[in-house]
């Protein structure tokens, strides 16, 4: 067990923090929640602090929750893959771009860390590019979200890891808006971190609302495992 | 865990100032004001961030109520100027462990016994 793997045993609160500004929107968010790495699960609420959302919230899902992959649930014989609980308390920087087919892109930098016992994202976001009328902009994606694999790979030259994926965003036409992901995340401590065989997280999403909540705001539920690495030729003997 | 106590409640006229306060017995994170007349439901009027930089309103009280909040004494505090007659019932005093400003009723973990507002 990595030494940051211990801080994930049990529930843990999280905390996360967005300013954006897309097309010169300028937005934040503040979502709370938390997470348990042994079930890889994550509960969270988000609100808009800043009025009406400007561009649709499953747009952000993963710059928020596939921000905090320390909680995926790694199986054991995959634990010294587990890149993101190792590089845990100090965290680690994430940065992506996301392309929006036919539309503008998102680029976003974040640190995932501990403060205290309580894991906290903090995200900038900068959108350009966007059609005002878009589906983006114009709103037109549907309010739920698709279950994806997320491939990871390590990046020895930065002691990091490096991340793609494509994520299928339903629009309210019945067609697919395509956002392609490309990631690295880099340690910010000095301390040692788990380099990774190549795998995937298989995610799993569900978005609601609750009733009782007057701002903009989005409710999420999420399943994240490890997956992709085979047990080794000892394992299948015993 | 900690004990909420509101007082400022009384019998106003409609159009007549009132000032509710609430003191905790020690830090908490976000707190807010819950407004519950005759027969309905507990609603939220206002809340404000432990760092005070977030607040927000229901769209009936904005322009009329203020809040604002004094951590070194853990009180919040409800400013109520041009009181109407749907303003009348029982205020609660409700607070949070973290420290998102929420406006739905089941993240608060915290609640006052409420203080009685009457409008005449």
């Known amino acids: 067990m990595s030494k940051g793997e211990e801080l994930f045993t049990g529930v843990v609160p999280i905390l996360v923090e967005l300013d954006g500004d897309v097309n010169g929107h300028k937005f934040s968010v503040s979502g709370e929640g938390e997470g348990d790495a042994t079930y890889g699960k994550l509960t969270l609420k988000f609100i808009c602090t800043t009025g009406k959302l400007p561009v649709p919230w499953p747009t952000l899902v993963t710059t928020f929750s596939y921000g905090v992959q320390c909680f995926s649930r790694y199986p054991d014989h995959m634990k010294q893959h587990d890149f993101f609980k190792s590089a845990m308390p100090e965290g680690y920087v994430q940065e992506r771009t996301i392309f929006f087919k036919d539309d503008g892109n998102y680029k976003t930098r974040a640190e995932v860390k501990f403060e205290g016992d309580t894991l906290v994202n903090r995200i900038e976001l900068k959108g350009i590019d966007f059609k005002e009328d878009g589906n983006i902009l114009g709103h037109k994606l549907e309010y739920n979200y698709n279950s994806h694999n997320v491939y990871i790979m390590a990046d020895k030259q930065k002691n990091g890891i490096k991340v793609n994926f494509k994520i299928r965003h339903n629009i309210e036409d019945g067609s697919v808006q395509l956002a392609d992901h490309y990631q690295q995340n880099t340690p910010i401590g000095d301390g040692p971190v788990l380099l990774p065989d190549n795998h995937y997280l298989s995610t799993q999403s569900a978005l609601s609302k609750d009733p009782n909540e007057k701002r903009d705001h989005m409710v999420l539920l999420e399943f994240v495992t490890a997956a992709g690495i085979t047990h080794g030729m000892d394992e299948l003997y015993k | 865990d900690v004990q909420l106590v509101e007082s400022g409640g009384g019998l106003v006229q409609a159009g007549d100032s009132l000032r509710l306060s609430c003191a905790a017995s020690?830090?908490?994170?976000?707190m807010a004001w819950f407004h519950q007349g005759l027969g309905k439901e507990r609603e939220f009027v206002g809340g404000?961030?432990?760092?005070?930089?977030?607040?927000y309103y229901a769209d009936s009280v904005k322009g009329r109520f203020t809040i604002d909040r004094d951590n070194a004494k853990n009180t919040v505090s409800l400013q109520m100027n041009s009181l109407k007659p749907e303003d009348m019932g029982v205020y609660y005093c409700?607070?949070?462990?973290?420290?998102?400003?929420?406006?739905?009723?089941?993240?608060?973990?915290?609640w006052g016994r409420g203080t009685q507002v009457t409008v005449s």
């Open positions: 404000i961030s432990p760092s005070g930089d977030n607040i």
């Open positions: 409700a607070a949070r462990r973290r420290v998102t400003l929420f406006t739905s009723r089941t993240d608060y973990e915290f």
């Open positions: 020690g830090p908490t994170g976000a």
